[in-house]
């Protein structure tokens, strides 16, 4: 058993049929010695008396809010949550496996630049009675500070018969050095509670590996005289790190016909313009990627050829 926060405790249980459970001793936080009784949740049934209460925690029915009273007055309370371990593996029932970039990916994180600011998100099909608390650091043995805000419900989607809820959190490295080579990874830890079930999820990454630039901005077409060719121009996204001479992007320019089956013409360039043939009913799209490190491409910025 360990303390998650003041008055909230996590009981770690091996979860299998007829498991013996864990013996837990609760102590009433009071100088009083006698006349103390214990109850669980909203029940008025007295579970025991005295300054301590010993319980055998085997299942969710044994978890909950234990309260000690004297003469109708609440003295203190302890919330017991359960963390299940099945076949040596901690349960992951609360969050959904996003399966990208690999199986057992529960937390996904992205950064728009090298400023030390990043966003993580996760999915669940559980609609309410949820608690999320997020902590982060760079490195784990001698951790350097990363400040995370509160998680927020960022999207709701219908997936077949189920509703899926996306939660996200923004974090900022306290003393980020955008130009420095990273040697220690960022660690993100999410404590998740659903009703009386506790789970924790972690992700470890370098900022350079989760970089995904915003799409190029101000995408414009300029027809070239007496030609089917156009000059496409764009700018670095506002959110990208500066100076651009150091934090450079490379670009992919794509001409795509109306039909997805039509052949796509693609040009790669380090410049912020390119000359392409604009076919009727086609569209031109441009995306960006860090020039010197193969992290994710941005989403496409698009304009119609006409």
């Amino acid at each position: 058993i360990w303390e998650l926060k003041k008055d909230v405790y996590v009981v770690e249980l091996d979860w299998y049929p007829d498991a013996p459970g864990e013996m837990v001793v609760l102590t009433c936080d009071t100088p009083e010695e006698d006349g103390i009784t214990w109850t669980l949740d909203q029940s008025s049934e007295v579970l025991g008396s005295g300054k301590t209460l010993t319980i055998q925690v085997k299942e969710f029915g044994d978890a909950g809010q234990y309260t000690c009273h004297k003469g109708g007055e609440v003295l203190s309370h302890s919330l017991l949550l359960l963390h299940k371990k099945e076949d040596g593996i901690w349960s992951t029932d609360i969050l959904k496996d996003q399966k990208e970039p690999k199986n057992k990916t529960f937390l996904r994180c992205e950064a728009k630049n090298y400023s030390g600011r990043f966003t993580c998100w996760w999915l669940t099909t559980i609609s309410t009675d949820l608690t999320f608390s997020v902590k982060s650091s760079r490195g784990s043995s001698d951790p350097q500070g990363v400040t995370c805000g509160a998680a927020t419900l960022s999207a709701e989607r219908v997936r077949g018969d189920n509703k899926e809820y996306e939660y996200s959190v923004e974090c900022q490295e306290d003393s980020a050095c955008p130009a420095a080579e990273e040697s220690l990874p960022i660690e993100v830890m999410v404590d998740a509670v659903h009703k009386l079930k506790y789970e924790n999820y972690t992700s470890s990454f370098f900022i350079r590996d989760i970089i995904k630039p915003d799409p190029p901005k101000n995408l414009q077409l300029k027809p070239l005289k007496n030609s089917r060719q156009v000059e496409v121009s764009w700018e670095y996204p506002d959110t990208w790190s500066t100076p651009h001479s150091y934090f450079s992007l490379t670009f992919c320019v794509q001409v795509q016909g109306k039909s997805k089956r039509e052949k796509k013409d693609r040009v790669f360039t380090d410049k912020t313009s390119a000359t392409v043939i604009c076919r009727k009913n086609a569209s031109i799209s441009v995306r960006a990627q860090d020039r010197y490190y193969s992290s994710s491409w941005s989403e496409w910025a698009s304009v119609p050829c006409s």
Epitope: H77, S133, A150
Partner: nanobody
Framework: EVQLVESGGGLVQSGDPLRLSCAAS?????MAWFRQAPGEEREFVAV??????NYADSVKGRFTVSADNAKNTMYLQMNSLKPEDTAVYYC?????????????????WGQGTQVTVSS
Amino acid sequence: EVQLVESGGGLVQSGDPLRLSCAASGPTYTMAWFRQAPGEEREFVAVISGGSTNYADSVKGRFTVSADNAKNTMYLQMNSLKPEDTAVYYCAGAGFYTTGTYYSLYDYWGQGTQVTVSS
């Protein structure tokens, strides 16, 4: 430490509405209402956290929780009040996301405001 102050309690007739307010001394991401009737355990009423809400079954459809983040204030609009809603109503707060119903999850507490519903 964030301070919470409840207001708006009072004596009303069965079926009447009442609006409670909870003012926080600083930004509080999650704010909740609990209530405690004489001789009863403190029970969850409603919570609002980053726009998400959760209600106790006993108040669903009658009570509405809302927040004005600019004023660091939460409200509980109580309609169709019943004698069994009589209790001291407490405001609770937390600095993280929760729609949980257990009061140990919450970090800060107000002193409470009395709501009495007469039949």
